[in-house]
């Protein structure tokens, strides 16, 4: 007999991604004997928390924690019982909670405390509930994308780890309340707040990142609604034949629409707003979200924010993917070039409500908002971030890679798994019949 290596045990980690519109739970797993102090982490399972994001529970913090129970109970079953105590559990909240923290810090604290109280009741190794900064959200999304697409380290056919020669991918995330752009850059950032130095697998990376609060899809829609009320009295991005009653208090309650709030407005007043299917006016309305008037640096993206020229390939995920997927799959429109993306947005914006409903069977939820969403994505990429046709050719729209959701959660987990000691592989006496 001789010593035979047992297959390494699996370790698990849980991340609750508390976004502005909803919360998702991701359970990750990796072999306990990790390579280079970073685990070979993949998604084990996931769970969508029903209802809105935790920031929507400002008036009912205990409701936020109660809403998580179903997914936490699922985690008890998805993670083997003997691994519960050693499984780290994190909750990271993003832009929805950043906004709540700006407007009502007490409510934000109460929600996090309520959630913390519930999470500590579970047998996992709870390691905190916190609000991620925009910079963290961007960087961890970048780490996730490059980790999953094996741009940091790869297992070769000869059974050895090597570093691929290809460069890293940039990452673009469009959430409900903010959007992030992150990519590797060679030159130092003119704005130190936009630069992050990372050391991964013994390699050094200089990364540019910026998060634009209030430029997430849901907040953009609210801002466009406020602009439409202010300037038109109709909504050029909504389809003709679609109309709805809008309560002014709802439109102006977000800090993102504060600048458009009329001095004296009746918050309980209701306004009937109709769509006009006007792509050109819609484009103008969306353009108003971006300011290019001043830049204190050698170059900017928009709103005076420093950004080096976009370089290399990019992966665009979350609402970037869903918007493009809608255009491609539901509308059957080509979106391989910037010109095609613009034409697709114009196509959607030209449709009447009846045409749109007929074109998209099963009446997709909030169908009326897809025009504005498509127009915003097109403008953000081309005018905002400065993608030209050549650079846009290097953008892939993806929601998953290697059966794992692309988003900040895995990157967050990867960063934190470095704190988890690796078990040595189990050695036992056995007969080797080879």
């Amino acid at each position: 007999t001789r010593d035979v290596r047992e297959p390494p045990a699996l370790k698990y980690g849980i991340v609750l991604d508390a976004g502005s519109s909803h919360t998702s739970m991701f359970i990750y797993k990796w072999p306990a004997d990790k390579e280079n102090d970073t685990g070979i982490v993949g998604q084990h399972s996931s769970c969508d928390v029903p209802g809105g994001g935790i920031s929507s529970y400002a008036d009912n913090p205990s409701g936020a924690s109660q809403s998580l129970v179903g997914c936490l109970e699922q985690a008890l079953q998805d993670v083997p019982k003997e691994r519960h105590a050693g499984t780290p559990l994190y909750l990271g909240a993003t832009a929805g909670m950043r906004l709540l923290n700006l407007t009502n810090p007490e409510a934000s604290t109460s929600v996090l405390m309520a959630v913390t109280h519930t999470l500590t009741q579970y047998p996992f190794d709870f390691r905190g509930a916190r609000i991620l900064s925009g910079q963290e959200e961007g960087v961890f999304g970048w780490v996730t994308a490059n980790y999953l697409l094996e741009n940091f380290i790869k297992y070769g056919w000869v059974g050895r780890w090597f570093r691929p020669r290809k460069g890293t991918l940039g990452a673009m995330d469009l959430g409900g309340a903010s959007t992030q752009i992150t990519f590797e850059t060679t030159s130092p950032a003119e704005d130190r707040a936009s630069e992050v130095q990372l050391h991964l697998y013994g390699q050094h990376y200089r990364v540019y990142t910026h998060s634009f609060l209030c430029y997430g899809r849901d907040q953009v829609l609210q801002r466009l609604l406020a602009s439409a009320l202010q300037t038109h009295g109709f909504h050029p991005c909504w389809p003709r034949g679609f109309s709805t009653q809008v309560l002014l208090g709802d439109v102006y309650q977000s800090p993102c629409t504060m600048a458009q709030r009329p001095q004296n407005f009746n918050s309980s007043a209701r306004v009937s707003l109709s769509g006009s299917s006007d792509p050109h006016l819609c484009r103008d309305l969306v353009s108003g979200l971006f300011s290019f008037s001043s830049c204190p640096f050698s170059r900017c993206s928009f709103n005076g924010v420093f950004q080096p020229p976009v370089a290399g390939n990019f992966v665009a995920f979350s609402a970037f993917f869903y918007t493009v997927d809608f255009l491609r799959t539901s509308m059957g429109l080509p979106v391989a070039t910037l010109q095609q993306l613009e034409a697709a947005a114009v196509n959607v914006c030209n449709q009447t409500w009846a045409q749109l409903q007929a074109r998209v069977p099963g009446q997709r939820a909030r169908l009326a908002d897809y025009c504005a969403g498509a127009m915003f994505v097109q403008q953000l990429l081309s005018r905002g971030y400065g993608f030209d046709e050549r650079a846009f050719g290097g953008v892939i729209f993806q929601k998953k890679a290697a059966d794992t959701a692309v988003g900040w959660a895995l990157g967050y987990m990867l960063n934190l798994t470095n704190l988890i000691p690796a078990d040595p592989p189990g050695l036992r006496k056995g007969t080797d019949f080879s």
């Epitope: 909803h22 809105g52 529970y57 997709r364």
Partner: antibody, heavy 125, light 106 residues
Framework: EVQLVQSGAEVKKPGESLKISCKAS????????MDWVRQMPGKGLEWMGD????????TYNQQFKGQVTISADKSIRTAYLQWSSLKASDTAMYYC??????????????????WGQGTLVTVSS | DIQLTQSPSSLSASVGDRVTITCSAS?????IHWFQQKPGKAPKLLIY???NLASGVPSRFSGSGSGTFFTLTISSLQPEDFATYFC?????????FGQGTKVEIK
């Protein structure tokens, strides 16, 4: 055709136990949560809780936690609502409802798409 | 908990009338669903996610709104529409219903 068939009306005395059922057909039972909704005489609707039959996980409205137990038997595609000790205030119509969903921007949004015919529970001494 | 307040609590109308029922939420919600309930029957889904007509529901029913204010409109009331209507939210735990609006024959 998707159908939810509930057990018949029950008349019970305070302190007695009861288990009512909801049998599903026409769809994959484990793909959807099953919820229970109470309607007291002449009143509105109240969500009580649900069961995820795939994982056998029950969640409850805090108002009903400890008062009722929700369970399911996958093998016979049936969800249950039970009381260990009934009170007169439990007199109501109880509905099971399938939790349907639609996907919007990668998020599942839920609604009750199919309902059982209801089980009337009368608790009286 | 999010309170849903329906207005009016009851109304009398004639066949052919246009009827509007409102549902006001105590906090902003993403969506509202509407149900119709006839005496002795289970509720039936009419509209999901604010404005989407459920399968088999006539086009005279429509829904709209956002945030904290939502409406259900019946463009031309038919004899079979006399019933009680409930709004329902699934944005904030626990999921709640409005108190109902009874539509009666004038």
């Amino acid at each position: 055709e998707v159908q939810l068939v509930q057990s018949g009306a029950e008349v019970k005395k305070p302190g007695e136990s009861l288990k009512i059922s909801c049998k599903a057909s026409g769809y994959t039972f484990t793909d959807y949560n099953m919820d229970w909704v109470r309607q007291m005489p002449g009143k509105g609707l109240e969500w009580m809780g649900d069961i995820n039959p795939k994982y056998d996980i029950s969640t409850y409205n805090q108002q009903f936690k400890g008062q009722v137990t929700i369970s399911a038997d996958k093998s016979i595609r049936t969800a249950y609502l039970q009381w260990s000790s009934l009170k007169a205030s439990d007199t109501a119509m109880y509905y099971c409802a399938r939790r349907g969903f639609f996907l919007y921007y990668g998020i599942n949004y839920y609604y009750f798409d199919v309902w059982g015919q209801g089980t009337l529970v009368t608790v009286s001494s | 908990d999010i309170q849903l307040t329906q207005s009016p609590s009851s109304l009398s109308a004639s066949v052919g009338d246009r009827v509007t029922i409102t549902c006001s939420a105590s906090s902003s919600v993403s969506y509202i669903h509407w149900f119709q309930q006839k005496p002795g029957k289970a509720p039936k889904l009419l509209i999901y996610s604010t404005s989407n007509l459920a399968s088999g529901v006539p086009s005279r029913f429509s829904g709209s709104g956002s945030g904290t204010f939502f409406t259900l409109t019946i463009s031309s009331l038919q004899p079979e529409d006399f019933a009680t209507y409930f709004c329902h939210q699934w944005s904030s735990y626990p999921w709640t219903f409005g108190q109902g609006t009874k539509v009666e024959i004038k």
